[in-house]
């Protein structure tokens, strides 16, 4: 119904009031709910109303505004500090102590974050985005610099329906359409072999506690696991001779361990250095990501930071020790 210049929506009635004609919803059941468009941001709850805009938002602090779009910094919150002597003593010993696994303590001096002391260094959001990994979308953190809010703004994160099958057939040079989705890792790009690669700038350099032969044997699972976390596809980089860039890594033992090793007499034939793991160089191929998502990494910096963020949360399924992003073509370093 309408009266004068006012156009009322389906189910609404036009009421003449002292301040002119107004639309009114006699029965919210029969009217379009203003909550249908999910207007309340940052976890605010939406309540249907009988008058325009037909909703009201109950905002979760520190947000306010008609759509919870405004961030209000809490009054004079003192900056968090890492006061504990315990944490000072335990930082950078290669072991993650949960009690020190906080932003203020640099994630136990990098022990909990793959040696990266501030994965959110480039995040300029007014929110402390490391505290907003909470299974709900926080738009102020949904930027590449803020690590896409840990991919919590992707709607309900779907799981791969035929996960076991897709894991077994990942990157096997045969396209399985049932696995050709973001949640299944796009079948390791098996269905995109005819498409041009779309490489992110830079290289991810990862140290993982698996010897090279074991890592290469398990490469498909390894790449799928990391690709799942990064919502894109990864591949092992090749050197100028076309060889896969997976090298033995001999570790960086603590001073105490080095001393113990030196005092232990070497047996005949015993190797000088034991292989502790592998250093692997990875590239990001966004050829499928860019078709399905606007949350793709243009370079490897934020991808490295996101892996560090997963280490902080304890959600890595491989024994990663460190991750760095290299911008230039690396020399073979160990």
């Amino acid at each position: 119904s309408s009266c004068g210049q006012v156009k009322c929506r389906k189910g609404e009635q036009c009421v003449h009031t002292a301040s002119g004609p107004r639309c009114f919803c006699p029965s919210p059941r029969d009217c379009e709910s203003g909550c249908a468009s999910s207007p309340c941001q940052h976890g605010g709850s939406c309540h249907p109303q009988r008058q325009p805009p037909y909703y009201s938002c109950q905002c979760a602090p520190p947000f306010s505004g008609s759509r919870c779009e405004l961030y209000t910094a809490p009054p004079s919150t003192p900056p968090a500090t890492c006061l504990s002597q315990y944490c000072a003593d335990k930082a950078r010993d290669g072991v993650c102590d949960e009690a020190c696994n906080s932003h203020a303590c640099q994630w136990d001096g990098g022990d909990c974050s793959l040696t990266m002391e501030n994965p959110w260094a480039n995040c300029s959001s007014p929110l402390p985005c490391w505290d907003y990994i909470n299974n709900q979308c926080d738009e102020l953190c949904n930027t590449v610099e803020c690590l896409f809010d840990n991919f919590e703004c992707q709607g309900n994160s779907k799981t791969c329906k035929y996960d076991k099958y897709c894991a077994d057939h990942f990157k096997d040079n045969h396209c399985d359409q049932g696995c050709n989705s973001e949640e299944c890792g796009w079948d390791g790009l098996d269905c995109a072999a005819d498409q041009p690669e779309n490489l992110a700038e830079g290289t991810l350099v990862i140290v993982v506690l698996m010897p090279p032969e074991q890592l290469l044997q398990d490469a498909r699972s390894f790449l799928r696991a990391l690709g799942t976390l990064l919502h894109t596809n990864l591949r092992i980089k090749r050197d100028s001779q076309g060889e896969l860039m997976v090298y033995p890594y001999y570790g960086e033992k603590s001073a105490a361990m080095k001393k113990q090793r030196m005092t232990r007499r070497s047996l005949p034939g015993e190797q000088e250095q034991e292989v502790a793991g592998s250093k692997v160089f990875l590239e990001i191929d966004n050829r499928q990501c860019v078709q399905d998502s606007d949350h793709c990494f243009k370079n490897t910096d934020a991808a490295a930071a996101l892996l560090a963020s997963h280490a902080i949360q304890g959600t890595l399924s491989y024994p990663l020790v460190s991750v760095v992003s290299e911008s230039l073509t690396p020399e073979r370093t160990q």
Epitope: Y86, V95, C96, E98, A99, L209, M257, A276
Partner: antibody, heavy 122, light 107 residues
Amino acid sequence: EVQLVESGGGLVQPGGSLRLSCAASGYSFTSYGMSWVRQAPGKGLEWVSYIYPYSGATYYADSVKGRFTISADTSKNTAYLQMNSLRAEDTAVYYCARHSGYYRISSAMDVWGQGTLVTVSS
Amino acid sequence: DIQMTQSPSSLSASVGDRVTITCRASQSVRSFLAWYQQKPGKAPKLLIYRASIRASGVPSRFSGSGSGTDFTLTISSLQPEDFATYYCQQYYISPSTFGQGTKVEIK
């Protein structure tokens, strides 16, 4: 199959020394932290010490600090507990146990050995 | 050090009973709490970690809940093989500490 086997327990006089061994198999030894946990006869469990074989970082309970030394030989996939200046109150079954969370001391212990008895008595 | 207090120290129950054991920490350990089962002469066995996650191979009748300072282990329907001693353990801050144990006996 992931397995831990302790050895080296026995009877020792107060003030004496003993070295316990924990041989690990069925998993990547360097990747996971390892703890020693003890249980005095008829009593509860007490955490003793932790090592992360990859970095060599070690942690100790105050009750054993300065007397016990934990170490690991990654070429043998074996963790050790060197116990010096032993006291009667160190009498217990000693278990080695693997931590479930790679380099995280803040993780539960998901695999345990069968235990080895240490008796400190004159 | 963080003190862990279990209650009760012992309890008698019958097969099929619902059994609840509580564990209280002297300060918050967030959700970094595990439950272990130990039978006489055997090593402890991990049942629950991160307060509520069942370890691999643990029957669904075992469940854990709680966070901060108060935690509960529940056995929904006690089976003959469940008669044992149960320990809680906080692993939030070193030194890791255990509760004194709860012995579950046959009534």
